[in-house]
């Protein structure tokens, strides 16, 4: 297992609809054809696999069937979007990238993106 650098933004604010997007960029030392990306949430004394996708370079990301994530890839960048977030989902979201094929296997783990989620205020009753 060889180490690889992964970069991601330090902070992201989710939209009022509970959607957060960020870019995960990895410094590929070679020409990987199969890449696996996993997003981990670390907060509240929990470590959760939020979503995971395996993709062939140049193809769409295929997330596992339970996924609340969508994403696209472009070169060594993965654009990730997490949907349906609630205020309690605020936490550190870590991007883990594995270059699965061809050998050698590379593993990179980012420093994490702190995602802040604010539940929308209910609309006040209107007289109109």
């Amino acid at each position: 297992c060889k180490a690889m650098h992964v970069a991601q933004p330090a902070v992201v604010l989710a939209s009022s609809r509970g959607i957060a997007s960020f870019v995960c960029e990895y410094a590929s030392p070679g020409k990987a054809t199969e890449v696996r990306v996993t997003v981990l949430r670390q907060a509240d004394s929990q470590v959760t696999e939020v979503c995971a996708a395996t993709y062939m370079m140049g193809n769409e990301l295929t997330f596992l069937d339970d996924s609340i994530c969508t994403g696209t890839s472009s070169g060594n960048q993965v654009n990730l979007t997490i949907q349906g977030l609630r205020a309690m989902d605020t936490g550190l979201y870590i991007c883990k990238v594995e270059l699965m094929y061809p050998p050698p296997y590379y593993l990179g783990i980012g420093n994490g993106t702190q995602i802040y989620v604010i539940d929308p205020e209910p609309c006040p009753d209107s007289d109109f």
Epitope: C51, L64, D66, G91
Partner: nanobody, 126 residues
Framework: EVQLVESGGGLVQAGGSLSLSCAAS????????MAWFRQTPGKEREFVAA????????SYADSLKGRFTISRDNAKNTVSLQMNNLKPEDTAVYYC???????????????????WGQGTQVTVSS
């Protein structure tokens, strides 16, 4: 209505292992998010581990990751918790819980789970 029945609890010495099992009935099991929680007298239920509908995604309490492993068998309608290197502080009643909404969540809370088993006692002696 989903019903959950836990089994596998008991008395074990520190450093030992136990495997808990939870059998579900009454609904399509593969559409349910499952979890294990535990509770000691006078304390709130504490999250242990959770697993997504297909079993492809998991969540663990930070302090337990590496010792405990959650898994599920959708063909047999069961979810299991393998507990290794048990410590006296793992002594608790362990509850199986189901979220029939089935949506995977980054943060796991007891309030997300509407169906609970009766619990199984795990006692770890020193």
């Amino acid at each position: 209505e989903v019903q959950l029945v836990e089994s596998g609890g008991g008395l074990v010495q520190a450093g030992g292992s136990l495997s808990l099992s939870c059998a579900a009935s009454g609904r399509t099991f593969s559409s349910i998010t499952m979890a294990w929680f535990r509770q000691t007298p006078g304390k709130e239920r504490e999250f242990v581990a959770a697993i997504s509908r297909s079993g492809s995604l998991t969540s663990y309490a930070d302090s337990l990751k590496g010792r405990f492993t959650i898994s599920r068998d959708n063909a047999k309608n069961t979810v299991s918790l393998q507990m290794n290197n048990l410590k006296p502080e793992d002594t608790a009643v362990y509850y199986c819980a189901a979220d029939t909404n089935g949506r995977w969540r980054p943060a796991i809370r007891p309030s997300d789970f509407e169906i609970w088993g009766q619990g199984t006692q795990v006692t770890v002696s020193s």
